[in-house]
């Protein structure tokens, strides 16, 4: 699930880390675009292990990620994607 | 405004089956995100975490206790509950329910009961 | 399992004093740490999240820090009402583990 929130919050990443995360392990993506309180793009990955985790948007392997889950939510593939504009 | 309160039997003895419910509001175990999880503490001790209980009923539990324990919920009733087998002396302790929210930033246990003192004595 | 050593499990300190705790993890958990802090008949309350930030409404006096694997959590002057035990935890994977906890006197 790939989520992508416009929100009035500050930052919610204390840190991030760029260690690669497969997909299998992957439950939900949320993208927090910069601006509205905070200055930097924020990427939240929670895991299905039940941990939490925000990732540095630079690292390759997110970037790839979210250009396959872009491609796919635009074809008929039955990838669910949200975008949510929370005023 | 979040708040959970546990009950339990206040006493029992060696062998039997602990049973402690968590009856909480502010918040549902249907929400993504949405966690349990119960802590207990010897009287003048630490806190030893025991489970985990999450929303879509993934459970997690103490290695050193797993076979004795069982966390489970009871959704619509804003509910959960731990099963501890086989107690013993040992198991002398308040148990605390605490709520965990699968949020950023991560805050586990950000809200406790109050706890309930269970005496096992024989 | 990972664990949390805690110290000292007991201290006493004056009043305006600079109070340090610590715990060591025995592997590394990336600062996936809390200090809670629990008062006499109370239950704990998240004092420090992430290590180093401060929680709702908890007054900046106290602070988190670490030292490669050492996790601190540290009053820079010591008031009356932060007589409590304090308790730390990692969370940075199952199971969660707590320090044994400081018992924090006032002299």
């Known amino acids: 699930v790939l989520e992508v929130y416009y929100t009035s919050l500050r930052c919610r990443c204390v840190q991030e880390s760029s260690v690669f995360i497969p997909r299998r392990f992957i439950d939900r993506i949320q993208i927090l675009p910069r601006g509205n309180g905070c200055p930097r793009k924020e990427i939240i990955v929670w895991k299905k292990n039940k941990s939490i985790v925000c990732v540095d948007p630079q690292a390759e392997w997110i970037q790839r990620m979210m250009e396959v889950l872009r491609k796919r939510s635009s074809s008929t593939l039955p990838v669910p994607v949200f975008k949510r504009k929370i005023p | 405004q979040v708040t959970l309160k546990e009950s339990g039997p206040g006493i029992l003895q060696p062998s039997q089956t602990l049973s402690l419910t968590c009856t909480f509001s502010g918040f549902s175990l249907s929400t993504y995100g949405m966690g349990v999880g119960w802590i207990r503490q010897p009287s003048g001790k630490g806190l030893e975490w025991l489970a985990n209980i999450w929303w879509d009923d993934d459970k997690y539990y103490n290695p050193s206790l797993q076979n004795r324990l069982t966390i489970s919920k009871d959704t619509s009733n804003n509910q959960a509950f731990l099963k501890i087998t086989n107690v013993d002396t040992a198991d002398t302790a308040t148990y605390y329910c605490a709520r965990s929210e699968l949020i950023m930033p991560y805050v586990p246990f950000d809200y406790w009961g109050q706890g309930v003192r269970v005496t096992v004595s024989s | 399992d990972i664990q949390m050593t805690q110290s000292p499990s007991s201290m006493s300190a004056s009043l305006g004093d600079r109070v340090t705790i610590t715990c060591q993890a025995s592997?590394?958990?990336?600062?996936?740490l809390i200090w809670f802090q629990q008062k006499p008949g109370k239950s704990p309350r998240p004092m420090i999240y992430y290590a180093t930030n401060l929680a709702n409404g908890v007054p900046s006096r106290f602070s988190g820090s670490r030292s490669g694997s050492d996790y601190s959590l540290t009053i820079s002057s010591l008031e009356s009402e932060d007589m409590a035990d304090y308790h730390c935890?990692?969370?940075?994977?199952?199971?969660?583990?707590f320090g044994s906890g400081t018992k924090l006197e006032i002299k």
């Open positions: 592997q590394d958990i990336d600062n996936h």
């Open positions: 935890l990692q969370f940075k994977q199952y199971p969660f583990t």
